[in-house]
């Protein structure tokens, strides 16, 4: 029976040509994790195996930096980086969690007004 | 230049153990997992064991666990498989391979007969 | 585990031929894809990575494609070092499995 949940950072935002760090965490559960896999839509990012380490897609590794932890850095944002992202746990023997976060990349002008006005 | 020498293969009886050793060159050891990877006679690849760069944690196919241990020594650029309990099923050829199974050495043969 | 199914099991194609292989995995794996080519009496070797990305010193003859669960080995024109058996192997989900080979001859 699959008992653990993920965190995540959740909905965020971010300004064009900055970066950001896409977190999740797996708990209540006492499974072994052994691969985390980021996706984006329907494209795989990087993997990070608990054994064989870091493995970023080539298409990505000018823009992607491993961690930090099983977390994975976006940098250069564009616009184009808005959408939904995806942390995959493989784990034995519960199987597999996955981990929704959804990143607004804004011009830089948006992302300082929007920080202005944010409610506490 | 990637070097990685499997030492340590030979025939056993079934239920015997031997330990294969790999011996790493022309990279730095310490800073990637490495793996065990099988192929029985005639027959495809498996893989059988990986270990963290550290060694601290390990992963092993479920047809060798229980019986099979991988484990590394980073001071003497060595990795190692420890197998006990030793069936005709796990007559192979053993490869050790770096990281991301982008170099392999030449290979260790095992066969488990009586 | 994921299984991975190549054909064909064995093909023989005349030298400058082109040759495809393919490689079905039994779920979506992205590009989470390798493929290796093993000479006779040799180790493997690795050819392609993330799909299609060729390893260092590969010649450009060789080259991977696909996504998904249908990914695709060719070699634009076949010269006699290309004799060998060829696997693919996914690396999206532990454990990682290997396509049963596809061994290539020269006519």
């Known amino acids: 029976m699959m008992t653990g949940t993920i965190e995540t950072t959740g909905n965020i935002s971010a300004e064009k040509g900055g970066s950001i760090i896409l977190q999740c965490h797996l708990s209540s559960t006492t499974a072994q994790v052994t691969q985390v896999n980021w996706e984006q839509q329907d494209q795989l990012l990087a993997i990070c195996n608990a054994d064989l380490g870091w493995h970023i897609s080539p298409s990505f590794k000018d823009r992607v930096a491993p961690g930090p932890g099983l977390g994975l850095t976006l940098q250069s944002l564009t616009v184009n980086d808005t959408g939904e992202y995806f942390c995959i746990y493989h784990t034995y023997p519960d199987g597999t969690y996955t981990g929704r976060i959804f990143l607004e990349v804004l011009e830089s002008s948006v992302a300082e007004h929007g920080a202005r006005f944010q409610i506490p | 230049e990637v070097q990685l020498v499997e030492s340590g293969g030979g025939l056993v009886q079934p239920g015997g153990s031997l330990r294969l050793s790999c011996a790493a060159s022309?990279?730095?050891?310490?800073?990637?997992?490495m793996s065990w990877v099988r192929q029985a006679p005639g027959k495809g690849l498996e893989l059988v064991a990986t270990?963290?760069?550290?060694?601290?944690?390990?992963n092993l196919a479920d047809s060798v666990k229980g019986r099979f241990t991988i484990s590394r020594d980073n001071s003497k650029n060595t990795l190692y498989l420890q197998m006990n309990s030793l069936r005709a099923e796990d007559t192979a050829v053993y490869y050790c391979?770096?990281?991301?199974?982008?170099?392999w050495g030449q290979g260790t043969t095992v066969t488990v007969s009586s | 585990d994921i299984q991975m199914t190549q054909s064909p099991s064995s093909l023989s194609a005349s030298v400058g031929d082109r040759v495809t292989i393919t490689c079905r995995a039994s779920q979506d794996i992205k590009t989470a894809l390798a493929w290796y080519q093993q000479k006779p009496g040799q180790s493997p070797k690795l050819l392609i990575y993330w799909a299609s990305t060729r390893q260092s010193g590969v010649p450009s003859r060789f080259s991977g494609s696909g996504s998904g669960t249908d990914f695709t080995l060719t070699i634009s024109s076949l010269q006699p070092e290309d004799v060998a058996t060829y696997y693919c192997?996914?690396?999206?989900?532990?454990?990682?499995?290997f396509g049963g080979g596809t061994k290539v001859e020269i006519k």
């Open positions: 022309g990279f730095t050891f310490s800073s990637y997992g």
């Open positions: 270990i963290k760069s550290s060694g601290g944690s390990t």
């Open positions: 192997q996914q690396y999206y989900s532990t454990p990682y499995t």
């Open positions: 391979v770096r990281g991301y199974f982008d170099y």
